[in-house]
């Protein structure tokens, strides 16, 4: 039975050109994490394998950095980065757990519009 739960950083609104950290945490299970995949829509961004370490997809190499921990850092954000990101935890013996984070990247003109938020 899958007893674990995934906690995420929560959805993030950020400004174009900035950087943000996406993080997930798997709790309430003793299952062993064998691999964590980070995906956006149907694109694989990065893999963190328990034995082999990190692999960043070639098309994201210059803007995606591994960590902290099992998280992912996205740099030089563009409006095109707006979308849903998935952390997919492959575990044994439980199976797969998935967390969802939506990233909204705003043009500077929109970001300044009437808000009192911390803009990453």
């Amino acid at each position: 039975m899958m007893t674990g739960t995934i906690e995420t950083t929560g959805n993030i609104s950020a400004e174009k050109g900035g950087s943000i950290i996406l993080q997930c945490h798997l709790s309430s299970t003793t299952a062993q994490v064998t691999q964590v995949n980070w995906e956006q829509q149907d694109q694989l961004l990065a893999i963190c394998n328990a034995d082999l370490g990190w692999h960043i997809s070639p098309s994201f190499k210059d803007r995606v950095a591994p960590g902290p921990g099992l998280g992912l850092t996205l740099q030089s954000l563009t409006v095109n980065d707006t979308g849903e990101y998935f952390c997919i935890y492959h575990t044994y013996p439980d199976g797969t757990y998935t967390g969802r984070i939506f990233l909204e990247v705003l043009e500077s003109s929109v970001a300044e519009h009437g808000a009192r938020f911390q803009i990453p």
Partner: antibody, heavy 117, light 112 residues
Framework: EVQLQQSGPELVKPGASMKISCKAS????????MNWVKQSHGKNLEWIGL????????SYNQKFKGKATFTVDKSSSTAYMELLSLTSEDSAVYYC??????????WGQGTTLTVSS | DVVVTQTPLSLPVSFGDQVSISCRSS???????????LSWYLHKPGQSPQLLIY???NRFSGVPDRFSGSGSGTDFTLKISTIKPEDLGMYYC?????????FGGGTKLEIK
């Protein structure tokens, strides 16, 4: 002035599909997400999901995955939601709403869908 | 999914009253950057819902200052300082911090 103009009421038969349109004006269509919300029985509000008109990226409430499909036509600043395999449970008022910072700033006037044989 | 519980379900008022509506979430709505995506809406009969407050306490443009929002973490409040006839309707809170976004069940503000 920001405006979201939705298509008119629909009466459709069970098992059919239908598409609701939402034409945006008064702002840069690709700069904001477009969200869809269901209101059943004149009370309950449910977030169906959103689309990013800039790149067509979508995010669905899992409850509506396979039921709703979002698309956009950037040339006409119009967002669409197609509802599939309709049943009486899908009878409701559907709203499009412009999103910013995970709130719904401006709403369309709503489209009433009645599913009945 | 995050469960959002709104109280009361119904709120009978007289014009001029001050009222509070509560919204509680099943988990914290603060993201890792300290931003909390909790907003409030008024849905008047025959109209579309309208945004009143976003980010806990920021009044949306054109919203009168008799509306104010407060709270943190899992506990949030909408206050209306002096009820006017145009304030009657259904009030909803919405959390947008966690996927999927979820609404409270609504509070009906009606005349006593």
């Amino acid at each position: 002035e920001v405006q979201l103009q939705q298509s008119g009421p629909e009466l459709v038969k069970p098992g059919a599909s239908m598409k609701i349109s939402c034409k945006a004006s008064g702002y840069s269509f690709t700069g904001y997400t477009m969200n869809w919300v269901k209101q059943s029985h004149g009370k309950n509000l449910e977030w169906i999901g959103l689309i990013n008109p800039y790149n067509g990226g979508t995010s669905y409430n899992q409850k509506f995955k396979g039921k709703a499909t979002f698309t956009v036509d950037k040339s006409s600043s119009t967002a669409y939601m197609e509802l599939l395999s309709l049943t009486s449970e899908d009878s409701a008022v559907y709203y499009c709403a412009r999103g910013l910072r995970f709130s719904l700033e401006y709403w369309g006037q709503g489209t009433t869908l009645t599913v009945s044989s | 999914d995050v469960v959002v519980t709104q109280t009361p379900l119904s709120l009978p008022v007289s014009f001029g009253d001050q009222v509070s509506i509560s919204c509680r979430s099943s988990q914290s709505l603060a993201n890792s950057y300290g931003n909390t995506y909790l907003s409030w809406y008024l849905h008047k009969p025959g109209q579309s819902p309208q945004l009143l407050i976003y980010g806990i306490s920021n009044r949306f443009s054109g919203v009168p200052d008799r509306f104010s929002g407060s709270g943190s973490g899992t506990d949030f409040t909408l206050k209306i300082s002096t009820i006017k006839p145009e304030d009657l309707g259904m009030y909803y809170c919405l959390q947008g911090t966690h996927q999927p976004w979820t609404f409270g069940g609504g509070t009906k503000l009606e005349i006593k």
